[in-house]
Interface confidence: low
C-alpha cells in the first residue's frame, strides 16, 4: 500500500493532525524533499554571519561572514578574522609573518620563503612578509655581461612594514 | 586565578534532561569564546557545542543538533549546556572550555587547541 504521505511535495509536510494532509511548511521552515513528516526549521545568520540566500519553503538559507572574516567549516559553519596580507591569524590577533615567511592571503598562515638554492637557482627578487622569493636563473647560467638583472634590494626586516 | 567549574551532571534515565552549568572566574568572560567538550570511557574528546563572547554565534556537533542548547549570562559569568532526549551515548564527562576571542565579536571554534581554560568536568550519565 502506498504511503499518502509520499505524494507531499517539497514544500509540505504530511500533517498526520489533519488525516495525513500536505499542508505548507510554516514560516521559518522548510522541507527539501517530498514525503516529509515535518519541516525543518530554518537556519538563522546572525551576529558575525549574514545571509547569503534567504530560506524558502523548499530549501535552507545560507550564510555567509560579514566583511572582516571569512568562512570556516561545511556550509560556513564559523567565521573567522581576516588579516592583512603579510600576517597570520595567532590565539592573540593577527600577527606580522616572521622574517623568512610569507602570507599573500587574508587568511591561512604564513609560508617559508622558497630556497632558491634547492633548484640551484639565485635569488631574483628578495622575499617579503607578503610575497614569496622569486627564483632566477641558476649563477652559473649568468654569464658576464649577459645579465640585465638587478641586485636584489635588502630583505626587510620583521616587524618594521607599515601598518 | 582562573576557574571553570561545571555543575549539574547526574544520573538520568533515556529521554530525559539535564542543564549543566559552568560558573567562570579570574577573566573577563565577555571576552572569552566558550565550549563544551565531552570525553566518553576510553574515547576521545568530542566537541559538543561552543558559543561566542557575545551570543551571537553557536555551534552544535551533529550529534548533539537539536536536543542540546547552549546559552551563556555574561552578567552572571556563567555558561549552560540544555541536554534534552538524552541518550546512553550522551554519557561521558562534560568539559567546560574558554578561550580569547580574536574572532570577537561573532567568534568561536570548534579546535580544542583554541581553548586556554579547562575546568575539571562533570559527569553525565544516560542509564534506565
Known amino acids: 500500500l502506498q504511503d499518502p504521505c509520499s505524494n507531499c511535495p517539497a514544500g509540505t509536510f504530511c500533517d498526520n493532525n489533519r488525516n495525513q494532509i500536505c499542508s505548507p511548511c510554516p514560516p521559518n521552515s522548510f522541507s527539501s524533499a517530498g514525503g516529509q513528516r515535518t519541516c525543518d526549521i530554518c537556519r538563522q545568520c546572525k551576529g558575525v554571519f549574514r545571509t547569503r540566500k534567504e530560506c524558502s519553503s523548499t530549501s535552507n538559507a545560507e550564510c555567509d561572514c560579514t566583511p572582516g572574516f571569512h568562512c570556516l567549516g561545511a556550509g560556513c559553519s564559523m567565521c573567522e578574522q581576516d588579516c592583512k596580507q603579510g600576517q597570520e591569524l595567532t590565539k592573540k590577533g593577527c600577527k606580522d609573518c616572521c622574517f623568512g615567511t610569507f602570507n599573500d592571503q587574508k587568511r591561512g598562515i604564513c609560508r617559508p620563503w622558497t630556497n632558491c638554492s634547492l633548484d640551484g637557482k639565485s635569488v631574483l627578487v628578495n622575499g617579503t612578509k607578503e610575497r614569496d622569493v622569486v627564483c632566477g636563473p641558476s649563477p652559473a647560467d649568468l654569464s658576464p655581461g649577459a645579465s640585465s638583472v638587478t641586485p636584489p634590494a635588502p630583505a626587510r626586516e620583521p616587524g618594521h612594514s607599515p601598518q | 586565578e582562573v576557574q571553570l567549574v561545571e555543575s549539574g551532571g547526574g544520573l538520568v534515565q533515556p529521554g530525559g534532561s539535564l542543564r549543566l552549568s559552568c560558573a567562570a572566574s579570574?577573566?573577563?568572560?565577555?571576552?572569552?569564546?566558550m565550549g563544551w567538550v565531552r570525553q566518553a570511557p576510553g574515547k576521545g574528546r568530542e566537541f559538543v557545542s561552543a558559543?561566542?563572547?557575545?551570543?551571537?554565534?553557536?555551534y552544535y556537533a551533529d550529534s548533539v543538533k537539536g536536543r542540546f542548547t547552549i546559552s551563556r549570562d555574561n552578567s552572571k559569568n556563567t555558561l549552560y549546556l540544555q541536554m534534552n532526549s538524552l541518550r546512553a551515548e550522551d554519557t561521558a564527562v562534560y568539559y567546560c572550555?574558554?578561550?580569547?576571542?580574536?574572532?570577537?565579536?561573532?567568534?568561536?571554534?570548534?579546535?580544542?587547541?583554541?581553548?586556554?581554560?579547562w575546568g575539571q568536568g562533570t559527569q553525565v550519565t544516560v542509564s534506565s
Open positions: 572550555a574558554a578561550g580569547y576571542s580574536y574572532l570577537y565579536p561573532g567568534g568561536l571554534s570548534t579546535r580544542p587547541s583554541f581553548y586556554d581554560y
Open positions: 558559543i561566542s563572547g557575545n551570543g551571537g554565534s553557536t
Open positions: 579570574g577573566f573577563t568572560f565577555s571576552s572569552y569564546a
